[in-house]
Interface confidence: medium
Amino acid sequence: SSPTSSASSFSSSAPFLASAVSAQPPLPDQCPALCECSEAARTVKCVNRNLTEVPTDLPAYVRNLFLTGNQLAVLPAGAFARRPPLAELAALNLSGSRLDEVRAGAFEHLPSLRQLDLSHNPLADLSPFAFSGSNASVSAPSPLVELILNHIVPPEDERQNRSFEGMVVAALLAGRALQGLRRLELASNHFLYLPRDVLAQLPSLRHLDLSNNSLVSLTYVSFRNLTHLESLHLEDNALKVLHNGTLAELQGLPHIRVFLDNNPWVCDCHMADMVTWLKETEVVQGKDRLTCAYPEKMRNRVLLELNSADLDCDPILPPSLQTS
């Protein structure tokens, strides 16, 4: 019988058991060494065990797989491909496993994979075809619905000579495989900008989390196609002002709620339209908490309490009067 137990408890497989049978094909429902398994809960947990590769003998019943806190380093192509395939695997959590490279086709042969969490891995090399599995211009649709990529930015010295934003976006857009993606979390990645085409090609998004990045402006980002977007998290960025085009697009999204806390809003004459909009809109959550960061005389003033008279710009001096 398989070494699994009831829903309320997990069975562990002893390492000596695994080595004893390693010469034979694995039993279909045995529990891998250093993992805990519950067939009733369809869950396997291989957590904080310093694993350097994905166990080969995962039970076929697994629906929820936790491989967090390990030392995986690289996810090769077909890292989860098994015969028979892991047809039930729906949720895969690889967070905090020291991954720095995810290769093309790493998640192939997982027909039911709906949630993938790669957070807290320093992904210096994320293949453009990590999620699409092939370099075709239009790939087979991925079953992914939730993709969690929070804090995947590697240290500065480990980054390739290319834009980190560009690398992530290439993986999101390759083969148009993620058309069904409904939740995308990209928090805490030091993003300076959002490539303009990324959102247009993810039309099913309901939730987009870009909080705790370094976004300065949304001027070139279009939200127009995201007609189902419910929540947009932009807290803790470097936003100075939202311009008319962005305000109109957000207002036009029928279900949207926007979170804008903790941005360094610049309360000068360019802020007038945003203040007017904030007073009228219901889409911004906690709008009464938004305060000015600059100029100094406006610091900590509440945006909703400002009048047009408060929002002035210092006149630009003609060149002849400017001092060096």
């Epitope: 939740r183 099913s204 309901r206 939730h207 007609t227 189902h228 419910e230 929540s231 029928p254 279900h255 709620r257 979170f259 959550q285 906690g286």
Partner: antibody
């Protein structure tokens, strides 16, 4: 796994109030709206309103405006729906569900019976 | 409020039949429509979202189509476990509104 577990059945007198709880687990409570839907015996589904657990914001169907209150306690991942001034036609199964657009996970339902 | 009118309100069919249920919105709702299945004593189960997207784990004999005001749920070859009540839900505008339901019974 995502689960919504509701409080047990209630029997109330006309004019009283009822408060139904909905405890969420298996996901981050504050990232999805909770909606409430009711179903009288042998009848169809009726949407009552929504509550955003992160902000506490709510929206109610006109029919229930002034009689319903949807709240939450984020420290215990629980949403509440309170319906006041109960009448016999409020006898129904009350469901909580996850999702601001189309709900994907539902609680098991709480039967509220209003009878004198 | 947007009214959702489902037809028929009930139908009798045999195993293997092709079944079509229609939902009509009182105003355009783009593709903001979901279909749910409910069996007696059970909670509703989502089958289709965004008018035509099949929920993961739902058999491919179910399909949805339509946009604007006219929507259809089709069961290609009715199975014994499909006998249930089906509801449409529009989520284009608040308040959300359900159709009144279509009961699919065994002939």
């Amino acid at each position: 796994q995502v689960q919504l577990v509701q409080s047990g059945a209630e029997v109330k007198k006309p004019g009283a109030s009822v408060k139904v709880s909905c405890k969420a687990s298996g996901y981050t409570f504050t990232t999805y709206d909770i909606i409430w839907v009711r179903q009288a015996t042998g009848q169809g589904l009726e949407w009552m309103g929504w509550m955003n657990p992160k902000s506490g914001n709510t929206g109610y169907a006109q029919k229930f405006q002034g009689r319903v209150s949807m709240t939450r306690n984020t420290s215990i991942n629980t949403a509440y729906m309170e319906l006041s001034t109960l009448r016999s036609e409020d006898t129904a199964l009350y469901y909580c569900a996850r999702g601001g657009l189309e709900p994907d996970y539902w609680g098991q339902g709480t039967l509220v019976t209003v009878s004198s | 409020d947007i009214q959702m009118t489902q037809s028929p309100s009930s139908l009798s069919a045999s195993v293997g039949d092709r079944v079509t249920i229609t939902c009509r919105a009182s105003q355009g709702i783009r593709n903001d429509l979901a279909w749910f299945q409910q069996k007696p004593g059970k909670t509703p189960k989502r089958l289709i979202y965004d008018a035509s997207n099949l929920q993961s784990g739902v058999p491919s004999r179910f399909s949805g189509s339509g946009s604007g005001t006219e929507f259809t749920l089709t069961i290609r070859s009715l199975q014994p476990e499909d006998f249930a009540t089906y509801y449409c839900l529009q989520y284009n505008r608040y308040p959300r509104t359900f159709g009144q339901g279509t009961k699919v019974e065994i002939k």
